[in-house]
């Protein structure tokens, strides 16, 4: 099947990093500077992403793969492939359209990014508060009050957990 397809479509022989040049009798031509093709059989090469302004280059563009950007210090990535950079705030703050604001009482943010989220209400899950929350940390819930009967072994609270909000594998 592969051979038949190759006979019918000479472009299928063009590897990544090249394109099938219609202007040159469908010969495989290398991608021009600042462009790439990540798969074989392409009829055009894609323009490389340019990391400008608050974006900085994490990985240079090659003939077979696009450039990858991240953000300059003081900013963090948002969206798949770091499509935008957003200003950092301090832990215990959130970024609003008017700038960084402290978390209100009853909310927390343990990252430099994102919003202040409400403390977990342990009682709604039938648990008790082991460690109180702060602007930077969620409360730590423990066993239900009924489980903490006299003579029960003491509970060591877990270390404060890192909040989600990082990139997929």
């Amino acid at each position: 099947f592969e051979r038949t397809r190759s006979l019918q479509d000479p472009c299928s022989n063009c590897p990544a990093g090249t394109f099938c040049d219609n202007n040159r009798n469908q010969i495989c031509s290398p991608c021009p500077p600042n462009s790439f093709s990540s798969a074989g059989g392409q009829r055009t090469c894609d323009i490389c992403r340019q990391c400008k302004g608050v974006f900085r280059t994490r990985k240079e563009c090659s003939s077979t793969s696009n450039a990858e950007c991240d953000c300059t210090p003081g900013f963090h990535c948002l969206g798949a492939g770091c499509s935008m950079c957003e200003q950092d705030c301090k832990q215990g703050q959130e970024l609003t359209k008017k700038g960084c604001k402290d978390c209100c009482f009853g909310t927390f943010n343990d990252q430099k990014r994102g919003i202040c989220r409400p403390w977990t209400n342990c009682s709604l899950d039938g648990k008790s508060v082991l460690v109180n929350g702060t602007k930077e940390r969620d409360v730590v819930c423990g066993p239900s009050p009924a489980d903490l009967s006299p003579g029960a072994s003491s509970v060591t609270p877990p270390a404060p957990a890192r909040e989600p909000g990082h990139s997929p594998q």
Epitope: A80, E86, I115, R117, P164, G165, S167, P168
Partner: antibody
Framework: QVQLVESGAEVKKPGASVKVSCKAS????????IHWVRQAPGQGLEWVGW????????NYAQRFQGRVTMTRDTSISTTYMELSRLRFDDTAVYYC????????????WGQGTLVTVSS | SYELTQPPSVSVAPGKTATITCGGD??????VHWYQQKPGQAPVLVMY???ERPSGIPERFSASNSGNTATLTISRVEAGDEADYYC?????????FGGGTKLTVL
């Protein structure tokens, strides 16, 4: 690639409980909040709450507080949403959705689980 | 609690521009996200952070947010754009969705 796969459809009687699961793959499970959103037949989207898979911390919409419990099992990258004291108007498709942090939005969704409450 | 108001339906001819609005008290001070949902399918994120387009979403989709109205604009509308569209914000510890707008392509 990121995938959220939910458990199958359920039929329950009024007053019963239902527990829906959502298995995550394609990313580090503890890196994304998981939210649950429901949609009654012919109606719009309604937020139920979230769980932080890293700490187990939760936040529930006011109208579900006392009836909903969200838990997770990090060993199998799965979150659960249990709704108790079911009523007829809990009949809906229940979706799990991932929130990558920042200002909450949902970039990946499960396929949905239809929960039917019928006597 | 915070409320988002969307028109129940919007109709548009193929090739024309569809405008879907989402009203809320000083919504311009909030961050708005938009979802598309086709019958029998889960919603799909089409715009986030007011005006950012996820990869894979056509450039025909754009959005803005100021004052009391956020707007999703779909230019050169195609039959495949027919769906329900929902706006969403974060307010006071809760995720809030608009009621949804059914876009009909004539």
């Amino acid at each position: 690639q990121v995938q959220l796969v939910e458990s199958g459809a359920e039929v329950k009687k009024p007053g019963a409980s239902v527990k829906v699961s959502c298995k995550a793959s394609g990313y580090t499970f503890t890196d994304y909040y998981i939210h649950w959103v429901r949609q009654a037949p012919g109606q719009g989207l309604e937020w139920v709450g979230w769980i932080n898979p890293n700490s187990g911390g939760t936040n529930y919409a006011q109208r579900f507080q006392g009836r909903v419990t969200m838990t997770r099992d990090t060993s199998i990258s799965t979150t659960y949403m249990e709704l108790s004291r079911l009523r007829f108007d809990d009949t809906a498709v229940y979706y799990c959705a991932s929130d990558p942090g920042g200002n909450p939005y949902f970039d990946y969704w499960g396929q949905g689980t239809l929960v039917t409450v019928s006597s | 609690s915070y409320e988002l108001t969307q028109p129940p339906s919007v109709s548009v001819a193929p090739g024309k521009t569809a405008t879907i609005t989402c009203g809320g008290d000083t919504i311009g001070s909030k961050v708005v996200h938009w979802y598309q949902q086709k019958p029998g399918q889960a919603p799909v994120l089409v715009m986030y952070y007011d005006s950012e387009r996820p990869s894979g979403i056509p450039e025909r989709f754009s959005a803005s947010n100021s004052g009391n109205t956020a707007t999703l604009t779909i230019s050169r509308v195609e039959a495949g754009d027919e769906a329900d569209y929902y706006c969403q914000v974060w307010d006071s510890g809760s995720v809030v969705f608009g009621g949804g707008t059914k876009l009909t392509v004539l």
